[in-house]
């Protein structure tokens, strides 16, 4: 009887341990405004907070500007990107803008980068208005393997809103791969 | 043997009970169009349905216009806000509008309110067009503690689309806090 | 004792089996650009990929242009729809456009269709700019029953961006119905 009980307890313990060790990974990364690249071309954003304010990470890694997957699974990925301009910042180079975000996945094993999601808008930010603002939201469900990296590219990075509630991206694991 | 069996059964029963009692909380709240505030500036929307049409709530509470967290955890929060104007409603005050949403968290213990997510756009709604429409979507993953409250603020509430498929917000728990 | 053990093992086995058989359903469907309807009116999009590139499906069915629910539950539904136009494609019929998406649910038992989510914007795509782009994102949490069908309707389908990272929709089950 004792052996049976030990066996049952062991099963529970294994389950509990595995559940604890492999707690569902997640990340919510917010823009680091002290290091936003200039210019209007498409650039990769590499400076994000992972441990202050709303930013947090668990069972994933943030390194070299990329969110690294540590655990195979299906993840919901999302990004919210805000752009803004006030006349006090000076004139824009052009009133016709492409404000875009691209969420990309890079595989180290097969060195290649692919866009998972994109969103945005062309905008006419006329000099007739003193303030302009625009936000993009994208989200989707993707299979990610350990070692794969998620990164964010935007056009017109100099127009990014630096607030933590404005410009962020994240992921959370929903289920294992069968 | 009977004692062992009872003990094992008890473990299962506890798990089942806990799982049932602490079923993952969620809410999907849709705008109550009979009580949309007037005005233009940033206002808190306090009238939402929680139990009709697509609206529903479980293991969370809706009170005084706020969605109250009953169970600690990491939640995915989202909001979809639609604005619209038809010329038959009369002229707008200005053709340049700020159409914005702010998803805020209030902690009762430390009486303070913080914006978790924001989105929107400045829009030029010209009098040359008889109909205008614009939707905002935001979403993100946040740690919420029991007793904390989620609320929605918008600019230009008089322009809100009152349909349940247009203006709503929600949350669902993804995982426990370690 | 052996009987007890078998009974306990059986419970575990049942749980594991059920967990495996009823693994959380999901789908991520990407636009099939070879079969996009023409015109500018509101149409249902029926051609989607479910098994190439980012597109995938598990424990749900894609048939006749609709995503069919096989397992009761609460699901997070999402859609990302991109519209674009380049002057090399010829002039638009009008510079004032309504770019919209509607995520609808159809119940076979009660033959009726209801919109769960909508989003979009009226746009002024002036001939003064050679390129125009706009993306919509919607998402929400809904109770879905086995046999119910999810479909996507858009205005101006001829303007859809055919990339898999641009125009897609999906769902994943979050929890059972109590």
């Amino acid at each position: 009887i004792r052996a049976e009980k030990a066996m049952v307890d062991g099963s529970w313990l294994d389950l509990a341990k595995r559940s604890k060790l492999e707690a569902q990974p997640f990340a919510h990364l917010t823009i680091n405004a002290t290091d936003i690249p200039s210019g209007s071309h498409k650039v990769s954003l590499s400076s994000w907070y992972h441990d202050r304010g709303w930013a947090k990470i668990s069972n994933m890694t943030f390194s070299n500007g990329k969110l690294i997957v540590n655990q195979d699974g299906f993840y919901y990925l999302y990004a919210n990107i805000c752009f803004r301009h006030h006349e006090t910042s000076g004139d824009l180079a052009t009133e016709y803008l492409q404000l875009m975000v691209y969420v990309t996945k890079t595989s180290i094993k097969i060195p290649s980068s692919h866009t998972l999601m994109k969103g945005g808008s062309t905008k006419y930010w006329s000099g007739n208005s003193e303030f302009h603002f625009y936000s993009i939201n994208v989200g989707g469900f993707f299979k990610l393997r350990s070692g794969e990296e998620i990164s964010i590219e935007v056009s017109n990075p100099s127009l990014l809103d630096p607030d933590q509630d404005a410009t962020y991206f994240g992921a959370f694991k929903v289920r294992d791969i069968d | 043997i009977r004692a062992e069996k009872a003990m094992v059964d008890g473990s299962w029963l506890d798990l089942a009970k806990r799982s049932k009692l602490e079923a993952q909380p969620f809410a999907h709240l849709t705008i109550n169009a009979t009580d949309i505030p007037s005005g233009s500036h940033k206002v808190s929307l306090s009238s939402w349905y929680h139990d009709r049409g697509w609206a529903k709530i479980s293991n969370m509470t809706f009170s005084n216009g706020k969605l109250i967290v009953n169970q600690d955890g990491f939640y995915y929060l989202y909001a979809n806000i639609c604005f619209r104007h038809h010329e038959t409603s009369g002229d707008l005050a200005t053709e340049y509008l700020q159409l914005m949403v702010y998803v805020t968290k209030t902690s009762i213990k430390i009486p303070s309110s913080h914006t978790l997510m924001k989105g929107g756009s400045t829009k030029y709604w010209s009098g040359n067009s008889e109909f205008h429409f614009y939707s905002i979507n935001v979403g993100g993953f946040f740690k919420l503690r029991s007793g904390e409250e989620i609320s929605i603020e918008v600019s230009n509430p008089s322009l809100l689309d009152p349909d349940q498929d247009a203006t709503y917000f929600g949350a669902f728990k993804v995982r426990d806090i370690d | 004792i052996r009987a007890e053990k078998a009974m306990v093992d059986g419970s575990w086995l049942d749980l594991a089996k059920r967990s495996k058989l009823e693994a959380q359903p999901f789908a991520h469907l990407t636009i099939n650009a070879t079969d996009i309807p023409s015109g500018s009116h509101k149409v249902s999009l029926s051609s989607w990929y479910h098994d190439r590139g980012w597109a995938k499906i598990s424990n749900m069915t894609f048939s006749n242009g609709k995503l069919i629910v096989n397992q009761d539950g609460f699901y997070y539904l999402y859609a990302n729809i991109c519209f674009r136009h380049h002057e090399t494609s010829g002039d638009l019929a009008t510079e004032y456009l309504q770019l919209m998406v509607y995520v609808t649910k159809t119940s076979i038992k009660i033959p009726s269709s209801h919109t769960l989510m909508k989003g979009g914007s009226t746009k002024y795509w002036s001939g003064n700019s050679e390129f125009h782009f706009y993306s919509i994102n919607v998402g929400g949490f809904f109770k879905l029953r086995s046999g119910e069908e999810i479909s996507i309707e858009v205005s101006n389908p001829s303007l859809l961006d055919p990339d898999q990272d641009a125009t897609y929709f999906g769902a994943f089950k979050v929890r059972d119905i109590d």
Epitope: S126 | H85, A93 | -
Partner: nanobody, 127 residues
């Protein structure tokens, strides 16, 4: 930036009339909501009247309803305030203002709705 310059102020007897003008430059005047405010000696600034971008809708403070008329000429980039049946209590510096962002004209009865302000023109009602 929008520059606003008021004119038309002066000394007038009780019961008399004045027409204030506000010339706008630097932006597309026609898209903005416009308003008139006034500040009497030793008092705070108070709302007088507002008009929407097209001129089709107006809003007045109770104290001037029926006596004052706000109007605009978008072709000339000019805002007007016709003041009739003037009273000593109307003595103040009158400011014109331009604002955008908000759909409801009632909101433009508050100072915070406006981004741009003129320097003001003095109206004195006295016998």
């Amino acid at each position: 930036e929008v520059q606003l310059v008021e004119s038309g102020g002066g000394l007038v007897q009780p019961g008399g009339s004045l027409r204030l003008s506000c010339a706008a430059s630097g932006r597309t005047f026609r898209s903005y909501a416009m308003g008139w405010f006034r500040q009497a000696p030793g008092k705070g600034r108070e709302f007088v009247a507002a008009i929407n971008y097209s001129g089709g809708s107006t809003n007045y403070a109770d104290s001037v309803k029926g006596r004052f008329t706000i109007s605009r000429d978008n072709a000339k980039n000019t805002l007007y305030l016709q003041m009739n049946s003037l009273e000593p209590e109307d003595t103040a510096v009158y400011y014109c203002a331009a604002g955008s962002g908000y759909a409801s004209l009632s909101y433009y009865s508050t100072e915070r709705a406006y981004t741009y302000w003129g320097q003001g023109t003095l109206v004195t009602v006295s016998s």
